[in-house]
């Protein structure tokens, strides 16, 4: 699986997941979230070579399409599969509140 | 929607649905595929700018990174959202079979 | 420049609905916390409601709760407010305005504000 | 809901004199929880002061803000033409924000 425990060991220069560290207030403008003060979300990227983890019938056949016609400008793109939430702490005023906010991790990646 | 209605008709640059004709037999090397001979199997392509059909939250906050950041090398990417089975023909020796190929036509894509 | 330009204010009858639009220019839209304030004629100000761009957390007066919906189109940089089962009391001139950070906070920048007028 | 009452209803002063309005909350907001707008007749509120000191951006150096807990004060040093309207403060210590209903400075 092109997951965090594979891709963050290994030097994969093909689809895999990358770490990527998003500081709230910095990269987003969010002055609102108060912790975390940012989150690895990371992200995916590196080619997709034939049959490279491929997510449905069409991604396996462009794939193959790339490798037979090697010209072509059509081909699968490095993607997130698996995701997971974040749980923020922020404040209404001076009440905190938390929150999961849904699919804000990338944990692994397919070619579609 | 950025489906095969819109795409095709408009000069999209952006992330899209774009039309690509496989031929089983000369694309694929698949000679065993009666009929069709071939099918449109479309492909998803260009760039993905914040917020353009954001798939998950994770899309939508790593093009607002991407924004913010641009000379950051994390961005969505353009890849299928809507698939279609395509309906094929083979013969098993002298008998002829129907199958419907799950997920084999792109008819619009996501920023993911 | 900030800009906050709202439209879809009009006089509508008590029960009706109406759709009030907030279109953002001139800073990153969804950085910022954004909020619906009206103002009865010859009144004074009255916090109606805010949402939080892309996690799309919302919260509401108890006046407009389950009548109102705040909601927001990153990718337009624009905000709504869905106002449902309307009453005459909630006649006013609706503003939207953006907070300086927080989700609760001092509002920098204001619309130039839409008439609501509900009467029969 | 935190109330907050301002004072007085309307002040009647002329040009060059000095203001000072006054914010009272019915329960304690800290020390920056509050803001201070003006309204013109027409117009949308203006952000002067917030986290109850704070100069907004382009406000000139004759509004102040001050005061913590539940009694906050505007002061206008030296009263322009231009400053001749309504005044609201407003909290977000608690849910839901809260205004108060306004002093009017008129001209005398």
């Known amino acids: 699986a092109l997951d965090t425990n594979y891709c963050f060991r290994n030097l994969e220069e093909n689809c895999c997941v990358r770490p990527l560290y998003i500081d709230f207030r910095q990269d987003l403008g969010w002055k609102w979230v108060h912790e975390p003060k940012g989150y690895y979300a990371n992200f995916c990227s590196g080619p997709c070579p034939y049959l490279r983890s491929a997510d449905t019938t069409h991604s396996t056949v462009l794939g193959l399409y790339n490798t037979l016609n090697p010209e072509a400008s059509a081909s699968p793109c490095c993607v997130p599969q698996d995701l997971e939430p974040l749980t923020i702490l922020y404040y209404v005023g001076r009440t905190p509140k938390v929150e999961q906010l849904s699919n804000m991790v990338v944990k692994s990646c397919k070619c579609s | 929607a950025l489906d095969t209605n819109y795409c095709f008709r408009n000069l999209e640059e952006n992330c899209c649905v774009r039309p690509l004709y496989i031929d089983f037999r000369q694309d694929l090397g698949w000679k065993w595929v009666h009929e069709p001979k071939g099918y449109y199997a479309n492909f998803c392509s260009g760039p993905c700018p914040y917020l353009r059909s954001a798939d998950t939250t994770h899309s939508t906050v790593l093009g607002l990174y991407n924004t913010l950041n641009p000379e950051a090398s994390a961005s969505p990417c353009c890849v299928p959202q809507d698939l279609e089975p395509l309906t094929i023909l083979y013969y098993v020796g002298r008998t002829p079979k129907v199958e419907q190929l799950s997920n084999m036509v792109v008819k619009s894509c996501k920023c993911s | 420049d900030v800009q906050l330009v709202e439209s879809g204010g009009d006089l509508v009858k008590p029960g009706g609905s109406l759709r009030l639009t907030c279109v953002a220019s001139g800073y990153t839209f969804s950085s910022n916390v954004m909020h619906w304030v009206r103002q009865a004629p010859g009144k004074g100000l009255q916090w109606v409601a805010y949402v939080i761009p892309i996690v799309d957390i919302a919260y509401y007066a108890d006046s407009v709760k389950g009548r109102f919906t705040i909601s927001i189109d990153n990718s337009k940089n624009t905000l709504y407010l869905q106002m449902n089962s309307l009453k005459t009391e909630d006649t006013a001139t609706y503003y939207c305005?953006?907070?300086?950070?927080?989700?609760?906070?001092?509002?920098?920048?204001w619309g130039q504000g839409t008439l609501v007028t509900v009467s029969s | 809901e935190t109330v907050l009452t301002q004072s007085p209803g309307t002040l009647s002063l002329s040009p060059g004199e000095r203001a000072t309005l006054s914010c009272r909350a019915s329960?304690?907001?800290?020390?920056?929880?509050l803001a201070w707008y003006q309204q013109k007749p027409g117009q949308a509120p203006r952000l002067l002061i917030y986290g109850a000191s704070s100069r907004a951006p382009g406000v000139p150096a004759r509004f102040s803000g001050s005061g913590s807990g539940t009694d906050f004060t505007l002061t206008i040093s030296s009263l322009e033409p231009e400053d001749f309207a309504v005044y609201y403060c407003?909290?977000?210590?608690?849910?839901?924000?809260?205004f108060g209903q306004g002093t009017k400075l008129e001209i005398k």
């Open positions: 329960q304690s907001l800290g020390s920056s929880y």
């Open positions: 407003q909290q977000y210590a608690d849910s839901p924000i809260t």
């Open positions: 305005a953006r907070t300086l950070g927080l989700v609760l906070d001092a509002m920098d920048y």
